[in-house]
């Protein structure tokens, strides 16, 4: 089907919408995946909680978002700022990074173009 | 190499049409989105329009939605732009360009661009 | 008048550095990736930086990018004769479902 898109949500509309959703399920699935389940992270109580439930978890939160790229974009830049400060080296930001944008197609949404992740202002 | 030639610019009057043309070579034309950028004499760059590799999404500036339709013919590996309505202030050079763009994580870059060509609309 | 915001003009003497910023919003710079052109007279822009910090083959380490919440910096080092042009950021904006260029720096080698 061809079509010419519209407006993609302004951005107010989509902050909140990052602010209303809960992401730290999102936060915690992430983690685990790149610690390992690891029990030395026990920032979060995530120990008693499979990383699939979490994932689970963190898709229906996204799925009560506008299912636009923009609204993907800001809360995927959301949880990058999150845990910016958790992410001990250039190596855990790396694969935090590669995680978070492989978690739009987990939750079967389409990842989003033109979303720049770095937005730590270079602190990740 | 990769080449990109407009075509189709010249001289028209306010309220009347053109049709550009951009010829692509050297590349695998159906792969990337193109874009079209102007410039008004002594001016600056403006972004034009966006067309996605299979035609299937397309951006317009505001101030020519509606009146400027962009498209491709990946077959023929081309590019143009049908511009209606024409008014003084759409007087530019007219450059096609490839956009790097690609499907997730990546921004709109211009990393080939035609010489251009001019259109001016004047009574 | 732009919605990217960079200085009109800057200048510097040859072998100097230079710095050319670009000014957006949350909507474009801070969410998007930003690319550079410089536009030598007479001639079609060629793309310097893309995605922030990276440099297509054949442009010379001497220029930069980088970006920090809604601003975006062009740097230019061994300032040469030949880098005189006019430089232009560009980004997408999320709220216009657009590319915006900002108006453009003319550099000046002294």
């Known amino acids: 089907m061809r079509r010419e898109r519209g407006r993609q949500g302004d951005s107010s509309s989509c902050e909140r919408q990052v602010d209303r959703v809960n992401l730290k399920p999102c936060e915690q699935h992430i983690m685990q995946r790149i610690m390992g389940e690891q029990e030395q992270y026990d920032s979060y109580d995530i120990r008693s909680t499979r990383s699939s439930d979490q994932q689970q978890r963190c898709c229906d939160e996204l799925n009560e978002m506008e299912n636009t790229q923009r609204c993907m974009c800001e809360a995927l830049q959301q949880i990058m700022e999150n845990q910016c400060d958790r992410l001990q080296d250039r190596q855990m930001v790396q694969q935090f990074k590669r995680e978070l944008m492989n978690l739009p197609q987990q939750c079967n949404f389409r990842a989003p173009q033109r979303c720049d992740l770095d937005v730590s202002g270079g602190r990740c | 190499e990769v080449q990109l030639v407009e075509s189709g610019g010249g001289l028209v009057q306010p309220g009347g049409s053109l049709r550009l043309s951009c010829a692509a070579s050297?590349?695998?034309?159906?792969?990337?989105?193109m874009t079209w950028v102007r410039q008004a004499p002594g001016k600056g760059l403006e972004w034009v329009a966006n067309?996605?590799?299979?035609?299937?999404?397309?951006d317009y500036l505001d101030s020519v939605r509606g009146r400027f339709t962009i498209s491709r013919d990946n077959a023929k590996n081309s590019l143009y732009l049908q511009m209606n309505s024409l008014r003084a202030e759409d007087t530019a050079v007219y450059y096609c360009?490839?956009?790097?763009?690609?499907?997730?994580?990546?921004?709109?870059?211009?990393?080939?661009w035609g010489q251009g060509t001019l259109v001016t609309v004047s009574s | 008048q732009s919605v990217l915001t960079q200085p009109p003009s800057v200048s510097a003497a040859p072998g100097q550095k230079v710095t050319i910023s670009c000014s957006g919003t949350g909507s474009n710079i801070g969410h998007n990736y930003v690319s550079w052109y410089q536009q030598l007279p007479g001639t079609a822009p060629k793309l310097l930086i893309f995605d922030n910090t990276k440099r297509p083959s054949g442009i010379p380490d001497r220029f930069s990018g980088s970006k920090s919440g809604s601003s975006a910096t062009l740097g230019i080092t061994g300032l040469q004769t030949g880098d005189e042009a006019d430089y232009f950021c560009a980004t997408w904006d999320a709220d216009l479902s657009a590319v915006l260029f900002g108006g453009g720096t003319k550099l000046t080698v002294l």
């Open positions: 050297g590349f695998k034309f159906s792969t990337f989105y």
């Open positions: 067309i996605k590799q299979d035609g299937s999404e397309k």
């Open positions: 360009t490839r956009n790097g763009l690609q499907d997730s994580y990546s921004g709109d870059f211009f990393d080939h």
